[in-house]
């Protein structure tokens, strides 16, 4: 409607690393003569409309969200209604709505995408000794405490992708971070390098691990 307060937020999701602080940007255009006494600002979880933080009756009513949110009080009068979310957790991921009411009202939703980098993969081999060409080995690539779920790629020493006989499992811990274990079953050649790449799709961060297997030369029993 004509004259309704226009609330603006970023179109793209805000990406925040677990444990860091995130700013959910929100702004409105104050009319001439605007004072904070006229402002009613509500931040809420979009899906449930659960209150996160509010500014009403001319004052900051504080955080209703685990005491981890704050406004920018010095900037409110200029139309900056952004919300600071401290110590971001996986559970914070989702959509937040900025609802502004002055003479009329308007709202807009901004998405928070949480991310955590994966650790450098550790590689284990089973069996890990007396290996000969032709043996079947299991190579496990493990990377820890990332978010969201990873994409895992295997390749050989020549960079050829290995897609068969790969089993990948991802388990979330109590914080919602994922531990990824990817298992490659491969028949050994004379020598071989096997690499695993663990990619965080949000951060576009790749973590690499590799193992080089030197097979024992083939020995034959002496002829009678």
């Amino acid at each position: 409607p004509t004259g309704a307060v226009e609330v603006q937020v970023p179109e793209d999701p805000v990406v925040a690393l677990v444990g860091t602080d995130a700013t959910l940007r929100c702004s409105f255009s104050p009319e001439p003569g605007f004072s904070l006494a006229q402002l009613n600002l509500i931040w809420q979880l979009t899906d449930t409309k659960q209150l996160v933080h509010s500014f009403t009756e001319g004052r900051d009513q504080g955080s209703a969200y685990a005491n981890r949110t704050a406004l920018f009080p010095d900037l409110l009068a200029q139309g900056n209604a952004s919300l600071r979310l401290q110590r971001v957790r996986v559970a914070d991921e989702g959509s937040f709505t900025c609802f502004v009411s002055i003479r009329d009202f308007g709202s807009a939703a901004v998405s928070l995408q949480v991310a955590a980098p994966y650790s450098k993969p550790s590689m284990t081999l089973e069996p890990n000794k007396d290996l000969r060409p032709g043996d079947t080995v299991t190579i496990t690539c493990s990377s820890y405490r990332g978010y969201p779920e990873a994409e895992v790629f295997w390749q050989d020493g020549q960079g050829v992708p290995l897609t068969g006989n790969v089993t990948t499992s991802q388990m979330a811990n109590e914080q919602g971070l994922f531990d990824v274990h990817s298992v490659l079953r491969v028949v050994l050649g004379a020598n071989g390098t096997y690499s695993c790449l663990v990619r965080n799709p949000v951060l576009q961060q790749d973590a690499h691990g590799s193992v080089t297997i030197t097979g024992q030369p083939m020995t034959f029993p002496p002829e009678a």
Epitope: P1, D47, T48, K49, L51, S95, F99, D104, F105, A109
Partner: antibody, heavy 124, light 109 residues
């Protein structure tokens, strides 16, 4: 259980105004949005505007801008919708419906409570 | 102006399952549109069934469920009852206003 009780039927002349009331009883929900919705004979539902009584702020549909005024009296838990310059095509049933700005229960039920409707007939 | 499209009419049988949809001219419906579904029967005031895309209002039978399907808001009635014959309106929130769809007349045969 919250109820919305609306004022009675009205018969009005073209060019005049009508003011319909909507009283909430049986408990309140913080920062509710009281919407006004109308339905002309044989037509669908049409949103006219809404008010947040706690804040005293209202919004209007473009179509009704300048012709409708929505107000609220928090002390009596009553919202009002006044429509001016009435025409015959304003003949309709007018409803108030409560939505929530903040869901204290953590569940957003939407426009879960409706008034019984007020019939407004515009005729010369 | 924002236009919303619903199926004008649908027919189903008692015990069957039917899905009503609501498409927006602005693009895909999201959770921030807070899709509402309202049931209207002749001579009665409208009744809010679903709010916030998929939250059943108190008193709404469990056979009614709301969702987003292929960028549209959807109302599914599983195990349709004869008393479900009515007109169903969707409503979507756009920042500062509600917009209603034209309604779907559901016939039970």
């Amino acid at each position: 259980q919250v109820q919305l009780v609306q004022s009675g039927a009205e018969v009005k002349k073209p060019g005049s105004s009508v003011k319909v009331s909507c009283k909430a009883s049986g408990g309140t929900r913080p920062a509710a949005l009281i919407n006004w919705v109308r339905q002309a004979p044989g037509q669908g539902l049409e949103w006219m505007g809404g008010i947040i009584p706690l804040f005293g702020t209202a919004n209007y549909a473009q179509k009704f801008q300048g012709r409708v005024t929505i107000t609220a009296d928090e002390s009596t838990s009553t919202a009002y919708m006044e429509l001016s310059s009435l025409r015959s095509d304003d003949t309709a049933v007018y409803y108030c419906a409560r939505d929530q700005v903040v869901a204290t229960s953590g569940v957003n039920f939407g426009m879960d409570v409706w008034g019984q409707g007020t019939t407004v007939t515009v005729s010369s | 102006d924002i236009q919303m499209t619903q199926e004008p009419s649908l027919t189903t049988s008692p015990g069957g399952t039917v899905t009503l949809t609501c498409r927006s001219s602005t693009g895909a419906v999201t959770t921030s549109n807070y899709a509402n579904w309202v049931q209207e029967k002749p001579g009665q005031a409208p009744r809010g069934l679903i709010g916030g895309t998929n939250k059943r209002a108190p008193g709404t039978p469990a056979r009614f469920s709301g969702s987003l399907i292929g960028g549209k808001a959807a109302l599914t009635i599983t195990g349709v009852q004869p008393e479900d014959e009515a007109i169903y309106f969707c409503a979507l929130w756009y920042s500062n206003l509600w917009v209603f769809g034209g309604g779907t007349k559901l016939e039970i045969k």
